[in-house]
């Protein structure tokens, strides 16, 4: 039989950050290869990663077509050296993935503070807008383009001489905060999608940036 001694894939897991989306599974293949198929609930199956010995498949190109759709993938197992034959009617073993809705489930990547500028007792802090592989009219969209006001940033800021972290929030990529004149401050930001209720509602914190270093400007 065409699928003798092949083992169905298991532990199918979506790994997705800022819409870069990879399906992972087990086991590492011994004398077998895999092909992945993906579809929306109402769509046709599309094959990807044909006869691969890897245990992951990058499905970003498919899911970015509509990040609000819900996707299902399945992984087929074939004997190593398998060649597609038109006469084969036996379906190879396969396993379905959990459903995946990119807009709701992609993790938020670690943000980066692009710059900060002090003017008197005000500091403007700008968060870098990350580019995604989501496209609209042949243009790549930023994270802010995709999520709009659903995405907020929390800024943590503190005097270099103190431990208490003040917070500010924005649904743009800019903060304007009050600071004490003559004090140096440090900053860190966190991306948040408040409407989410699961582990993926927050990013990890950005690297800390402090005044007196190269990212900042000071004007009286």
């Amino acid at each position: 039989s065409g699928t003798t001694n092949t083992v169905a894939a298991y532990n199918l897991t979506w790994k997705s950050t800022n819409f870069k989306t990879i399906l992972e599974w087990e086991p590492k293949p011994i004398n077998q290869v895999y092909t992945v198929q993906i579809s929306t609930k109402s769509g046709d199956w599309k094959s990807k990663c044909f006869y691969t010995a890897d245990t992951e498949c990058d499905l970003t190109d498919e899911i970015v077509k509509d990040v609000k759709q819900t996707y299902l993938a399945r992984v087929f197992s074939y004997p190593a050296g398998h060649v597609e034959s038109t006469g084969s009617t036996e379906e190879p073993p396969y396993e379905n993935s959990p459903e995946f809705t990119p807009y709701l489930e992609t993790n938020l990547g670690q943000p980066t503070i692009q710059s900060f500028e002090q003017v008197g007792t005000k500091v403007n802090v700008t968060v870098q807008d990350e580019w995604t592989l989501v496209r609209r009219n042949d243009t790549f969209l930023s994270l802010r383009d995709v999520f709009g006001k659903d995405l907020i940033y929390t800024l943590y800021y503190w005097k270099s001489s103190s431990s208490g972290k003040k917070t500010a929030k924005t649904n743009t990529n800019e903060f304007l905060i009050d600071v004490d004149k003559g004090e140096n401050y440090c900053f860190s930001v966190q991306a948040v999608i408040p409407s989410r209720r699961t582990a993926n509602r927050k990013s990890t914190d950005s690297p800390v940036e402090c005044m007196g270093h190269e990212k900042g400007e000071s004007r009286e």
Partner: antibody, heavy 120, light 107 residues
Framework: EVQLVESGGDLVRPGGSLRLSCAAS????????IHWVRQAPGKGLEWVGY????????YYADSVKGRFTISADTSKNTAYLQMNSLRAEDTAVYYC?????????????WGQGTLVTVSS | DIQMTQSPSSLSASVGDRVTITCRAS??????VAWYQQKPGKAPKLLIY???FLYSGVPSRFSGSRSGTDFTLTISSLQPEDFATYYC?????????FGQGTKVEIK
């Protein structure tokens, strides 16, 4: 169902210490920010401090800075308020509240409160 | 710190009356103002967020508005269950601060 339950309130002598707990259910505290707010008898609401359990960041009201410490144990889904060097003016009902970190984030969910009385 | 000056500190009104409570922020807080209702022995309950948005489950007789740094809570037709203390709160910046409260009593 989202619930916050404070405990640990008691009668304590001036200069004494007390630890309050805020046990959360129906959500995971590390995805949110937890605040402590207090209310002295017959008085208004006073913010005490916050913790972001995802990174341990905290900030305190000037009136408690250096005396109170907020912490969280994410494995127990519980936030704590450690109160040292207590004074008569710390007598109050202490509430914990959840902040969802939205731009408009008010304190949507509150616990029922626990009474701390500082008296000799 | 931003001060929230709330007035009046108390008022007497009758069922059916229109009641207005105001809060003035000492500096710009955008729309980051919430209103809470508190009854004796109970925790505060959220009524209004973002200055003018009615929280889920709150009766439509409650409304909020903003004019610059002035914020208003209006109860269009006071009901028996509305006799309570009301607080405004800014959460534009740390520390978040509350108004002193307005006690709404039966006339």
């Amino acid at each position: 169902e989202v619930q916050l339950v404070e405990s640990g309130g008691d009668l304590v002598r001036p200069g004494g210490s007390l630890r309050l707990s805020c046990a959360a259910s129906g959500f995971t505290i590390s995805y949110y920010i937890i605040h402590w707010v207090r209310q002295a008898p017959g008085k208004g609401l006073e913010w005490v401090g916050y913790i972001d359990p995802s990174n341990g960041y905290t900030y305190y009201a000037d009136s408690v800075k250096g005396r109170f410490t907020i912490s969280a144990d994410t494995s127990k889904n519980t936030a704590y308020l450690q109160m040292n060097s207590l004074r008569a003016e710390d007598t109050a009902v202490y509430y914990c509240a959840r902040d969802d970190q939205s731009v408009s984030s008010p304190f949507e969910y509150w616990g029922q409160g626990t009474l701390v009385t500082v008296s000799s | 710190d931003i001060q929230m000056t709330q007035s009046p500190s108390s008022l007497s009104a009758s069922v059916g009356d229109r009641v207005t409570i105001t809060c003035r922020a000492s500096q710009d807080v955008n729309t980051a103002v919430a209103w809470y209702q508190q009854k004796p022995g109970k925790a505060p309950k959220l009524l209004i967020y973002s200055a003018s948005f009615l929280y889920s489950g709150v009766p439509s007789r409650f409304s909020g508005s903003r004019s610059g740094t002035d914020f208003t809570l209006t109860i269009s037709s006071l009901q028996p269950e509305d006799f309570a203390t009301y607080y405004c709160q800014q959460h534009y910046t740390t520390p978040p601060t509350f108004g002193q409260g307005t006690k709404v009593e039966i006339k």
